[in-house]
Amino acid sequence: YFGKLESKLSIIRNLNDQVLFIDQGNRPLFEDMTDSDCRDNAPRTIFIINMYKDSQPRGMAVAISVKCEKISTLSCENRIISFKEMNPPDNIKDTKSDIIFFQRSVPGHDNKMQFESSSYEGYFLACEKERDLYKLILKKKDELGDRSIMFTVQNED
Protein backbone atom coordinates (compact mmCIF):
# COMPACT_ATOMS: atom_id res chain seq x y z
CA TYR A 1 0.00 0.00 0.00
CA PHE A 2 1.32 3.43 -0.97
CA GLY A 3 -0.17 6.69 0.29
CA LYS A 4 0.76 10.00 -1.32
CA LEU A 5 2.71 12.52 0.73
CA GLU A 6 4.26 15.80 -0.44
CA SER A 7 5.83 16.59 -3.81
CA LYS A 8 8.89 18.51 -4.85
CA LEU A 9 10.17 19.97 -8.12
CA SER A 10 13.54 18.63 -9.21
CA ILE A 11 16.11 18.59 -11.97
CA ILE A 12 17.54 15.11 -12.52
CA ARG A 13 21.00 14.60 -14.00
CA ASN A 14 23.12 11.59 -14.82
CA LEU A 15 26.67 11.42 -13.51
CA ASN A 16 27.96 12.95 -16.75
CA ASP A 17 25.96 16.04 -15.73
CA GLN A 18 23.49 15.63 -18.58
CA VAL A 19 19.99 16.88 -17.78
CA LEU A 20 16.93 14.65 -17.99
CA PHE A 21 14.11 16.12 -20.07
CA ILE A 22 11.02 14.92 -21.85
CA ASP A 23 11.18 15.54 -25.59
CA GLN A 24 8.34 16.44 -27.98
CA GLY A 25 7.65 12.76 -28.50
CA ASN A 26 7.28 12.25 -24.74
CA ARG A 27 10.56 10.36 -24.52
CA PRO A 28 12.79 10.78 -21.45
CA LEU A 29 16.27 11.74 -22.71
CA PHE A 30 19.48 13.17 -21.30
CA GLU A 31 21.27 16.08 -22.91
CA ASP A 32 24.10 18.49 -22.14
CA MET A 33 22.53 21.76 -21.00
CA THR A 34 23.73 24.96 -19.45
CA ASP A 35 21.73 26.33 -16.53
CA SER A 36 20.06 28.80 -18.90
CA ASP A 37 19.24 25.96 -21.35
CA CYS A 38 17.72 24.13 -18.45
CA ARG A 39 15.53 27.12 -17.56
CA ASP A 40 14.62 27.77 -21.20
CA ASN A 41 13.51 24.15 -21.63
CA ALA A 42 11.27 24.19 -18.56
CA PRO A 43 8.82 22.62 -17.85
CA ARG A 44 10.32 19.75 -19.84
CA THR A 45 13.34 19.68 -17.51
CA ILE A 46 11.39 20.04 -14.26
CA PHE A 47 10.21 16.79 -12.73
CA ILE A 48 7.68 16.46 -9.97
CA ILE A 49 8.91 13.88 -7.48
CA ASN A 50 5.83 12.69 -5.63
CA MET A 51 6.73 10.97 -2.37
CA TYR A 52 4.65 8.12 -0.98
CA LYS A 53 4.32 6.49 2.40
CA ASP A 54 5.05 2.77 2.05
CA SER A 55 3.32 0.23 4.27
CA GLN A 56 6.51 -1.88 3.96
CA PRO A 57 9.39 0.56 4.38
CA ARG A 58 11.82 -0.16 1.56
CA GLY A 59 13.34 3.25 0.98
CA MET A 60 11.70 6.44 -0.23
CA ALA A 61 8.85 5.50 -2.56
CA VAL A 62 8.39 8.04 -5.35
CA ALA A 63 6.49 8.61 -8.57
CA ILE A 64 8.10 10.89 -11.15
CA SER A 65 5.86 13.19 -13.14
CA VAL A 66 6.19 16.10 -15.55
CA LYS A 67 3.64 18.79 -16.38
CA CYS A 68 3.79 20.06 -19.93
CA GLU A 69 0.34 20.50 -21.43
CA LYS A 70 -0.91 17.71 -19.22
CA ILE A 71 0.61 15.71 -16.38
CA SER A 72 2.48 12.57 -17.41
CA THR A 73 3.92 10.02 -15.01
CA LEU A 74 6.90 7.74 -15.50
CA SER A 75 5.97 4.08 -15.82
CA CYS A 76 7.99 0.89 -16.26
CA GLU A 77 5.13 -1.30 -17.43
CA ASN A 78 6.50 -4.52 -18.96
CA ARG A 79 9.97 -3.24 -18.04
CA ILE A 80 9.70 -0.50 -20.67
CA ILE A 81 10.10 3.13 -19.60
CA SER A 82 7.49 5.56 -20.84
CA PHE A 83 5.54 8.58 -19.66
CA LYS A 84 1.84 7.87 -19.33
CA GLU A 85 -0.71 10.66 -19.36
CA MET A 86 -1.95 10.39 -15.77
CA ASN A 87 -1.78 12.05 -12.38
CA PRO A 88 0.00 10.05 -9.70
CA PRO A 89 -2.86 8.60 -7.63
CA ASP A 90 -3.35 9.48 -3.98
CA ASN A 91 -3.38 5.84 -2.98
CA ILE A 92 -2.11 2.61 -4.50
CA LYS A 93 -3.55 -0.50 -2.89
CA ASP A 94 -0.67 -2.81 -3.72
CA THR A 95 2.93 -3.41 -2.66
CA LYS A 96 4.12 -2.99 -6.26
CA SER A 97 3.32 -0.45 -8.92
CA ASP A 98 4.74 0.36 -12.34
CA ILE A 99 4.88 4.05 -11.39
CA ILE A 100 6.54 3.65 -7.98
CA PHE A 101 10.32 3.62 -7.65
CA PHE A 102 12.44 3.45 -4.52
CA GLN A 103 14.79 6.42 -4.44
CA ARG A 104 17.83 5.62 -2.33
CA SER A 105 21.18 7.26 -1.92
CA VAL A 106 24.27 5.35 -3.00
CA PRO A 107 26.07 4.16 0.16
CA GLY A 108 28.51 6.81 1.32
CA HIS A 109 27.25 9.33 -1.27
CA ASP A 110 24.17 11.18 -0.09
CA ASN A 111 24.02 13.23 -3.31
CA LYS A 112 23.98 10.22 -5.66
CA MET A 113 20.65 8.45 -6.11
CA GLN A 114 19.46 5.14 -7.47
CA PHE A 115 15.86 4.43 -8.45
CA GLU A 116 14.77 0.80 -8.12
CA SER A 117 11.46 -0.34 -9.58
CA SER A 118 8.90 -1.48 -7.04
CA SER A 119 7.45 -3.85 -9.66
CA TYR A 120 10.71 -5.47 -10.73
CA GLU A 121 13.23 -6.20 -8.00
CA GLY A 122 16.80 -5.58 -9.12
CA TYR A 123 15.73 -3.32 -12.01
CA PHE A 124 16.91 0.29 -11.91
CA LEU A 125 16.44 3.48 -13.86
CA ALA A 126 19.54 3.86 -16.01
CA CYS A 127 20.99 6.12 -18.65
CA GLU A 128 22.01 4.28 -21.78
CA LYS A 129 23.35 5.56 -25.07
CA GLU A 130 21.44 4.36 -28.12
CA ARG A 131 22.88 5.67 -31.36
CA ASP A 132 23.19 9.42 -30.70
CA LEU A 133 20.59 9.58 -27.92
CA TYR A 134 21.07 9.15 -24.18
CA LYS A 135 17.88 7.44 -23.04
CA LEU A 136 16.31 6.78 -19.66
CA ILE A 137 15.66 3.05 -19.52
CA LEU A 138 14.89 0.35 -16.97
CA LYS A 139 17.81 -2.02 -16.60
CA LYS A 140 18.38 -5.19 -14.64
CA LYS A 141 21.61 -4.53 -12.80
CA ASP A 142 23.79 -6.68 -10.59
CA GLU A 143 26.76 -4.33 -10.51
CA LEU A 144 25.40 -1.61 -8.29
CA GLY A 145 28.53 0.54 -8.51
CA ASP A 146 27.83 1.18 -12.19
CA ARG A 147 27.54 4.93 -12.77
CA SER A 148 24.77 4.44 -15.36
CA ILE A 149 22.26 3.78 -12.56
CA MET A 150 23.32 6.79 -10.46
CA PHE A 151 21.72 10.24 -10.68
CA THR A 152 21.76 13.57 -8.92
CA VAL A 153 18.49 15.21 -7.93
CA GLN A 154 18.52 18.99 -7.53
CA ASN A 155 15.51 20.43 -5.75
CA GLU A 156 14.02 23.49 -7.45
CA ASP A 157 11.42 24.45 -4.82
Epitope: P57, R58, G59, R104, P107, D142, E143, L144, G145
Partner: antibody, heavy 126, light 107 residues
Protein backbone atom coordinates in the same frame (compact mmCIF):
# COMPACT_ATOMS: atom_id res chain seq x y z
CA UNK B 1 17.78 -23.32 2.91
CA UNK B 2 19.31 -23.31 -0.57
CA UNK B 3 21.98 -25.91 -1.31
CA UNK B 4 24.19 -26.18 -4.37
CA UNK B 5 25.40 -29.67 -5.30
CA UNK B 6 28.24 -29.89 -7.80
CA UNK B 7 29.41 -32.75 -10.01
CA UNK B 8 32.35 -34.91 -9.01
CA UNK B 9 36.09 -34.54 -9.49
CA UNK B 10 37.53 -34.72 -13.00
CA UNK B 11 40.94 -35.58 -14.43
CA UNK B 12 41.61 -34.13 -17.88
CA UNK B 13 44.45 -34.04 -20.37
CA UNK B 14 45.87 -30.72 -21.61
CA UNK B 15 43.83 -29.38 -24.53
CA UNK B 16 40.64 -31.14 -23.42
CA UNK B 17 37.45 -29.55 -22.08
CA UNK B 18 35.62 -30.01 -18.80
CA UNK B 19 31.99 -29.33 -17.94
CA UNK B 20 31.07 -28.89 -14.28
CA UNK B 21 27.44 -28.92 -13.14
CA UNK B 22 25.80 -27.21 -10.18
CA UNK B 23 22.29 -28.22 -9.10
CA UNK B 24 20.11 -26.10 -6.84
CA UNK B 25 18.14 -27.90 -4.17
CA UNK B 26 15.72 -26.19 -1.83
CA UNK B 27 13.62 -23.11 -2.34
CA UNK B 28 15.29 -20.20 -4.09
CA UNK B 29 13.69 -16.86 -4.86
CA UNK B 30 13.76 -15.33 -8.31
CA UNK B 31 16.27 -12.64 -9.17
CA UNK B 32 19.43 -14.59 -8.44
CA UNK B 33 22.48 -15.25 -10.61
CA UNK B 34 24.99 -18.10 -10.76
CA UNK B 35 28.65 -17.18 -10.42
CA UNK B 36 31.68 -19.41 -10.83
CA UNK B 37 34.82 -18.95 -8.75
CA UNK B 38 37.95 -21.08 -8.86
CA UNK B 39 40.82 -21.71 -6.48
CA UNK B 40 44.14 -23.21 -7.57
CA UNK B 41 45.91 -25.37 -4.95
CA UNK B 42 47.23 -23.17 -2.15
CA UNK B 43 46.07 -19.98 -3.92
CA UNK B 44 43.31 -17.41 -3.51
CA UNK B 45 39.83 -17.12 -4.97
CA UNK B 46 39.41 -16.03 -8.59
CA UNK B 47 36.13 -14.91 -10.18
CA UNK B 48 35.41 -16.46 -13.57
CA UNK B 49 32.01 -15.08 -14.52
CA UNK B 50 28.29 -15.29 -14.04
CA UNK B 51 25.06 -16.22 -15.79
CA UNK B 52 21.60 -14.76 -15.33
CA UNK B 53 19.07 -17.64 -15.42
CA UNK B 54 16.32 -15.19 -16.39
CA UNK B 55 17.75 -14.45 -19.83
CA UNK B 56 20.95 -16.53 -20.04
CA UNK B 57 23.06 -13.38 -20.32
CA UNK B 58 26.65 -13.84 -19.20
CA UNK B 59 29.56 -11.77 -17.96
CA UNK B 60 33.02 -13.35 -18.09
CA UNK B 61 36.35 -12.33 -16.65
CA UNK B 62 38.59 -11.16 -19.51
CA UNK B 63 41.16 -13.92 -19.00
CA UNK B 64 38.55 -16.67 -19.44
CA UNK B 65 36.20 -15.18 -22.03
CA UNK B 66 37.65 -17.11 -24.99
CA UNK B 67 37.58 -20.47 -23.18
CA UNK B 68 34.62 -20.47 -20.82
CA UNK B 69 30.93 -21.07 -21.50
CA UNK B 70 28.33 -20.76 -18.75
CA UNK B 71 24.86 -22.16 -19.33
CA UNK B 72 21.80 -22.92 -17.26
CA UNK B 73 18.89 -25.32 -17.52
CA UNK B 74 15.91 -23.72 -15.78
CA UNK B 75 13.85 -26.92 -16.01
CA UNK B 76 16.31 -28.76 -13.77
CA UNK B 77 17.64 -25.75 -11.80
CA UNK B 78 21.16 -26.63 -12.90
CA UNK B 79 24.00 -24.36 -13.96
CA UNK B 80 26.98 -25.50 -16.02
CA UNK B 81 30.47 -24.17 -16.56
CA UNK B 82 32.53 -25.50 -19.45
CA UNK B 83 36.21 -24.64 -19.75
CA UNK B 84 38.03 -25.59 -22.95
CA UNK B 85 41.67 -25.82 -24.07
CA UNK B 86 42.67 -26.91 -20.58
CA UNK B 87 46.24 -26.43 -19.38
CA UNK B 88 48.00 -27.46 -16.19
CA UNK B 89 47.42 -24.00 -14.67
CA UNK B 90 43.66 -24.74 -14.77
CA UNK B 91 44.08 -27.36 -12.07
CA UNK B 92 41.83 -25.96 -9.35
CA UNK B 93 38.71 -26.39 -7.29
CA UNK B 94 35.78 -24.83 -9.15
CA UNK B 95 32.90 -23.42 -7.09
CA UNK B 96 29.44 -22.31 -8.13
CA UNK B 97 27.71 -19.76 -5.95
CA UNK B 98 24.45 -17.81 -5.98
CA UNK B 99 24.50 -14.03 -6.24
CA UNK B 100 21.44 -12.57 -4.58
CA UNK B 101 20.15 -9.30 -3.23
CA UNK B 102 20.40 -8.74 0.50
CA UNK B 103 18.92 -5.54 1.89
CA UNK B 104 19.73 -3.26 4.78
CA UNK B 105 17.12 -1.75 7.09
CA UNK B 106 16.29 0.99 4.58
CA UNK B 107 15.80 -1.47 1.74
CA UNK B 108 19.09 -0.61 0.05
CA UNK B 109 20.26 -3.57 -2.07
CA UNK B 110 23.59 -5.37 -1.83
CA UNK B 111 24.48 -8.38 -3.97
CA UNK B 112 26.02 -11.23 -2.03
CA UNK B 113 27.49 -14.65 -2.81
CA UNK B 114 25.59 -16.56 -0.18
CA UNK B 115 25.11 -20.23 -1.08
CA UNK B 116 28.17 -22.11 -2.35
CA UNK B 117 28.62 -25.55 -3.87
CA UNK B 118 31.01 -28.00 -2.25
CA UNK B 119 33.54 -27.45 -5.05
CA UNK B 120 34.70 -29.65 -7.92
CA UNK B 121 38.38 -30.51 -8.23
CA UNK B 122 39.55 -30.45 -11.84
CA UNK B 123 43.04 -31.85 -12.37
CA UNK B 124 44.76 -31.22 -15.69
CA UNK B 125 47.66 -33.58 -16.24
CA UNK B 126 49.23 -35.43 -19.13
CA UNK C 1 39.45 -3.52 -13.34
CA UNK C 2 39.18 -2.75 -9.64
CA UNK C 3 42.18 -4.04 -7.68
CA UNK C 4 41.67 -5.22 -4.11
CA UNK C 5 44.82 -5.09 -1.97
CA UNK C 6 44.37 -7.12 1.19
CA UNK C 7 46.76 -7.01 4.12
CA UNK C 8 48.40 -8.63 5.93
CA UNK C 9 48.79 -11.80 3.86
CA UNK C 10 49.18 -13.76 7.08
CA UNK C 11 48.92 -13.05 10.77
CA UNK C 12 49.75 -15.10 13.86
CA UNK C 13 47.58 -14.48 16.89
CA UNK C 14 46.38 -16.11 20.09
CA UNK C 15 42.91 -16.96 21.36
CA UNK C 16 41.39 -13.80 22.85
CA UNK C 17 43.41 -11.43 20.63
CA UNK C 18 41.89 -8.67 18.55
CA UNK C 19 42.74 -8.96 14.86
CA UNK C 20 42.23 -6.46 12.05
CA UNK C 21 42.40 -7.21 8.32
CA UNK C 22 42.21 -4.46 5.72
CA UNK C 23 41.24 -4.26 2.07
CA UNK C 24 42.09 -1.29 -0.12
CA UNK C 25 40.19 -0.85 -3.38
CA UNK C 26 41.76 0.92 -6.36
CA UNK C 27 38.58 3.05 -6.69
CA UNK C 28 35.42 3.84 -4.74
CA UNK C 29 33.33 0.67 -4.36
CA UNK C 30 30.42 2.34 -2.50
CA UNK C 31 30.50 -0.22 0.37
CA UNK C 32 29.66 -3.04 -2.07
CA UNK C 33 32.12 -5.21 -0.20
CA UNK C 34 31.73 -8.64 1.37
CA UNK C 35 34.00 -10.63 3.67
CA UNK C 36 34.33 -14.42 3.57
CA UNK C 37 35.92 -17.00 5.83
CA UNK C 38 37.37 -20.17 4.30
CA UNK C 39 38.64 -23.26 6.08
CA UNK C 40 40.84 -25.88 4.35
CA UNK C 41 38.89 -28.10 1.97
CA UNK C 42 35.69 -26.10 2.44
CA UNK C 43 33.80 -23.50 0.42
CA UNK C 44 33.96 -19.87 1.56
CA UNK C 45 31.38 -18.73 4.10
CA UNK C 46 29.77 -15.29 4.06
CA UNK C 47 30.52 -13.20 7.16
CA UNK C 48 29.72 -9.57 6.30
CA UNK C 49 28.04 -7.78 3.40
CA UNK C 50 27.63 -4.11 2.58
CA UNK C 51 30.96 -3.51 4.36
CA UNK C 52 29.42 -3.63 7.85
CA UNK C 53 26.30 -5.81 7.91
CA UNK C 54 26.65 -9.08 9.80
CA UNK C 55 25.25 -12.14 8.06
CA UNK C 56 22.67 -14.08 10.09
CA UNK C 57 24.28 -16.62 12.40
CA UNK C 58 27.73 -15.02 12.34
CA UNK C 59 29.05 -14.27 15.85
CA UNK C 60 29.06 -10.61 16.90
CA UNK C 61 32.81 -10.68 17.52
CA UNK C 62 33.11 -10.19 13.75
CA UNK C 63 32.58 -6.65 12.53
CA UNK C 64 33.22 -4.72 9.35
CA UNK C 65 33.73 -1.04 8.65
CA UNK C 66 34.83 1.31 5.92
CA UNK C 67 33.63 3.28 2.92
CA UNK C 68 35.03 4.62 -0.32
CA UNK C 69 38.23 2.65 -0.91
CA UNK C 70 39.22 1.52 2.61
CA UNK C 71 37.63 -1.42 4.42
CA UNK C 72 38.38 -3.35 7.59
CA UNK C 73 37.36 -6.68 9.10
CA UNK C 74 37.84 -6.92 12.85
CA UNK C 75 37.62 -9.99 15.07
CA UNK C 76 37.33 -8.61 18.59
CA UNK C 77 38.32 -11.70 20.56
CA UNK C 78 39.68 -14.63 18.59
CA UNK C 79 38.16 -18.05 19.21
CA UNK C 80 39.79 -21.36 18.20
CA UNK C 81 37.32 -21.82 15.33
CA UNK C 82 38.30 -18.45 13.78
CA UNK C 83 41.69 -19.69 12.55
CA UNK C 84 41.10 -19.72 8.80
CA UNK C 85 41.72 -17.67 5.65
CA UNK C 86 39.71 -14.47 5.09
CA UNK C 87 38.90 -12.83 1.77
CA UNK C 88 37.29 -9.56 0.79
CA UNK C 89 35.30 -9.27 -2.45
CA UNK C 90 34.24 -6.11 -4.27
CA UNK C 91 30.81 -6.42 -5.88
CA UNK C 92 30.64 -2.89 -7.21
CA UNK C 93 31.58 -3.60 -10.83
CA UNK C 94 32.51 -6.47 -13.11
CA UNK C 95 34.91 -8.14 -13.14
CA UNK C 96 34.38 -8.99 -9.48
CA UNK C 97 37.70 -9.10 -7.66
CA UNK C 98 38.82 -10.74 -4.45
CA UNK C 99 41.58 -9.68 -2.12
CA UNK C 100 44.60 -11.98 -2.02
CA UNK C 101 43.49 -13.48 1.27
CA UNK C 102 44.73 -13.30 4.88
CA UNK C 103 45.72 -16.51 6.60
CA UNK C 104 45.03 -16.31 10.32
CA UNK C 105 47.26 -18.77 12.19
CA UNK C 106 47.63 -19.76 15.82
CA UNK C 107 50.66 -18.19 17.47
Amino acid sequence: QVQLVQSGAEVKKPGASVKVSCKVSGEISTGYYFHWVRQAPGKGLEWMGRIDPEDDSTKYAERFKDRVTMTEDTSTDTAYMELSSLRSEDTAVYYCTTWRIYRDSSGRPFYVMDAWGQGTLVTVSS
Amino acid sequence: DIQMTQSPSSVSASVGDRVTITCLASEDIYTYLTWYQQKPGKAPKLLIYGANKLQDGVPSRFSGSGSGTDYTLTISSLQPEDFATYYCLQGSKFPLTFGQGTKLEIK
